[in-house]
């Protein structure tokens, strides 16, 4: 049988049966997610699930910029230090870098100084690039 | 070494106020969630209030929503509970308390401090 | 609200002896993020709790490897596998899952 690999949205790329849009436009982590979420089809600001998806994505990215950071669907939202995805994926792998400093930074960016492997904490309302995900 | 201390506590009227407070040292305050926790004379224990590092979030359960208030000075390393309208089911022991976490995972209420005593009677 | 109930109330244990104590939580308490925040606390007589375990299984650091924790979903056991002097107490869970957290009503153990 052939099977056919689904196409994702112009402008997104596909890997292991997800879409991922990335924006180069400025926004808050939220309306990063509304954005998102606008494209349909169940998209959301992106979960992380594994260091292979870790490194496509940052391989990606690469292609584009090295310089600054990205949001992704990590967030806080209860502000009690006990992460969630924003699509309901579990919270299992993790690539933190180093210890938060605390000071009201409850969403997570990809940071630009592992070459986009690792995440950090910010402020919510930071204006930033964004990647979204969804499963076609 | 991670200390925190509670003070504030006495013997008050009921519908009356009292504000305890806690001072902390030995650790990076404003980096962790803190706790006011309670003990009543019958050894029940209940969390009472919450407040996130950053000290703009502030979480309650019913029983006292509305008439205490958490807050924190992170410059000073100290977190307040403002107790108002108490009731005499309020007399309690209470704790101060940090939850341990790396900022990315919380891990339990790792540090109490020695509890401040409250007695709310007529 | 979470209501943990635990039992027994009280448990007196021989030196040496294991010694068990189980908490059950009305509802489930794996949080949204797939991890269950409960703990255990032991509070020594006129000494304020500390923590024993957290996220069910993990032990704080500086607690004996004697005690462990485990369970899911509703229901959670503290296991102490050779009882010690120091370990009498009043002993307590709770759950950080879901606002408010709440706490059991605690298990107090005794030495025989």
């Known amino acids: 049988d052939i099977i056919m690999r689904p196409s994702c949205a112009p402008g997104w790329f596909y890997h292991k049966s997800n879409c991922y849009g990335y924006f180069r436009k400025l926004r808050n982590w939220s309306d990063a997610e509304l954005e998102c979420q606008s494209y349909g089809n169940g998209a959301h600001l992106a979960s992380i699930l594994s260091l292979k998806e870790a490194s496509t994505i940052a391989e990606y990215i690469s292609g584009y910029q090295r310089s600054q950071p990205i949001w992704i669907g990590l967030h806080d939202p209860q502000k009690r230090q006990q992460w969630q995805w924003i699509d309901g994926a579990m919270y299992l792998y993790r690539s933190w870098s180093g210890k938060s400093m605390g000071g009201n930074k409850h969403c997570a960016e990809m940071s630009s100084n592992n070459n986009f492997l690792t995440w950090s904490s910010n402020e919510c309302n930071k204006r930033q690039h964004f990647l979204c995900k969804y499963r076609p | 070494e991670v200390k925190v201390v509670a003070s504030g506590g006495i013997l008050v009227q009921p519908g009356g106020s009292l504000k305890l407070s806690c001072t902390a040292s030995g650790f990076t305050f404003r980096s962790y969630v803190m706790s006011w926790v309670r003990q009543n004379p019958e050894k029940r224990l209940e969390w009472v209030a919450e407040?996130?590092?950053?000290?703009?979030?502030?979480h309650y359960p019913d029983s006292v929503k509305g008439r205490f208030i958490i807050s924190r000075d992170n410059d000073n390393h100290i977190l307040y509970l403002q107790m108002n309208s108490l009731k005499s089911e309020d007399t309690a022991m209470y704790y101060c308390?940090?939850?341990?976490?790396?900022?990315?995972?919380?891990?339990?209420?790792?540090?109490w401090g020695q509890g401040t005593s409250v007695t709310v009677s007529s | 609200d979470v209501l943990m109930t635990q039992t027994p109330l009280s448990l007196s244990v021989s030196l040496g002896d294991q010694a068990s104590i189980s908490c059950r939580s009305s509802q489930t308490i794996a949080h949204r993020n797939g991890i269950t925040y409960l703990e255990w606390y032991l509070q020594k007589p006129g000494q304020s709790p500390k923590l024993l375990m957290y996220k069910v299984s993990n032990r704080f650091s500086g607690v004996p490897d004697r005690f462990s924790g485990s369970g899911s979903g509703t229901d959670f056991t503290l296991k102490i596998s050779r009882v010690e002097a120091e370990d009498l107490g009043l002993y307590y869970c709770?759950?950080?899952?879901?606002?408010?957290?709440?706490f059991g009503g605690g298990t107090n153990l005794e030495i025989k």
């Open positions: 308390v940090r939850h341990g976490s790396t900022g990315y995972d919380y891990f339990g209420m790792d540090y």
């Open positions: 709770f759950q950080n899952s879901h606002l408010p957290p709440t």
């Open positions: 407040i996130n590092d950053g000290g703009s979030y502030t």
